[in-house]
């Protein structure tokens, strides 16, 4: 099979790290500096990715694999293969077109990326709020009043914060 395939297409024998060179009668040529081919049978080598600016090099390029980038501190990767770097925000914030903004009341974000999400609605599950939510943390739902049998110690709800749903600053 290999012999048949190579007779049909000599390029199929060119391994990773090489390309099938039309300028050399289709013999396999090693990839030139700062280029790579990660699979066999390639007709060109791809230029190595350069991690510049807000990107930093996580893995150097080689003749058989591309460089891999991540983001400098204060930024995080977005997209396949870290194609973009997005600014980090603090917990309790989300990134908008105007920069990092605090989560609106009733929403939270416990990460440095992503959007603010609504607090869990405990009553939808027939439960009560055990711990109030904050900008950084979701509410903690407790057992429903019906779950507490007579005589069982009930959980005293926390004192309300000055701004409902937020911890005192």
């Amino acid at each position: 099979f290999e012999r048949t395939r190579s007779l049909q297409d000599p390029c199929s024998n060119c391994p990773a790290g090489t390309f099938c060179d039309n300028n050399r009668n289709q013999i396999c040529s090693p990839c030139p500096p700062n280029s790579f081919s990660s699979a066999g049978g390639q007709r060109t080598c791809d230029i190595c990715r350069q991690c510049k600016g807000v990107f930093r090099t996580r893995k150097e390029c080689s003749s058989t694999s591309n460089a891999e980038c991540d983001c400098t501190p204060g930024f995080h990767c977005l997209g396949a293969g870290c194609s973009m770097c997005e600014q980090d925000c603090k917990q309790g914030q989300e990134l908008t077109k105007k920069g990092c903004k605090d989560c609106c009341f009733g929403t939270f974000n416990d990460q440095k990326r992503g959007i603010c999400r609504p607090w869990t609605n405990c009553s939808l599950d027939g439960k009560s709020v055990l711990v109030n939510g904050t900008k950084e943390r979701d509410v903690v739902c407790g057992p429903s009043p019906a779950d507490l049998s007579p005589g069982a110690s009930s959980v005293t709800p926390p004192a309300p914060a000055r701004e409902p749903g937020h911890s005192p600053q």
């Epitope: 790290g17 090693p30 990839c31 030139p32 500096p33 700062n34 080689s62 003749s63 058989t64």
Partner: nanobody
Framework: AVQLVESGGGSVQPGGSLRLSCAAS????????SAWYRQAPGKQRELVAW???????HYADSAKGRFTISRDNTNKTAYLQMNSLNVEDTAVYYC?????WGQGTQVTVSS
């Protein structure tokens, strides 16, 4: 002019060894890949072993486990140590660096 000059070819019996050398003039070894090719009569020239630009050695399937490529940048010389030679290894062996080719050295394996 930049030149590559091979040496070390010859006749050897099956199972024998040879060490090919490729001496370069000029400054190409610090820039380009070093590679060894071979061409048997009536066949296309094929890549046998090469040191890539990232200084990693690579081998064609036919050379793996038997051939070793190395390079001495100080002496501007590349080497191909060939062990366990068999009749199919008979060919003219060429040194290559970038666009520069050596004149070739004959390797003949026969009993």
């Amino acid at each position: 002019a930049v030149q590559l000059v091979e040496s070390g070819g010859g006749s050897v019996q099956p199972g024998g060894s040879l060490r090919l050398s490729c001496a370069a003039s000029g400054n190409i070894f610090n820039i380009h890949v070093s590679a060894w090719y071979r061409q048997a009569p009536g066949k296309q020239r094929e890549l046998v072993a090469w040191i890539a630009w990232d200084n990693v050695a690579h081998y064609a399937d036919s050379a793996k486990g038997r051939f070793t490529i190395s390079r001495d940048n100080t002496n501007k010389t590349a080497y191909l140590q060939m062990n366990s030679l068999n009749v199919e290894d008979t060919a003219v062996y060429y040194c290559n660096s970038g666009d520069i080719w050596g004149q070739g050295t004959q390797v003949t394996v026969s009993s």
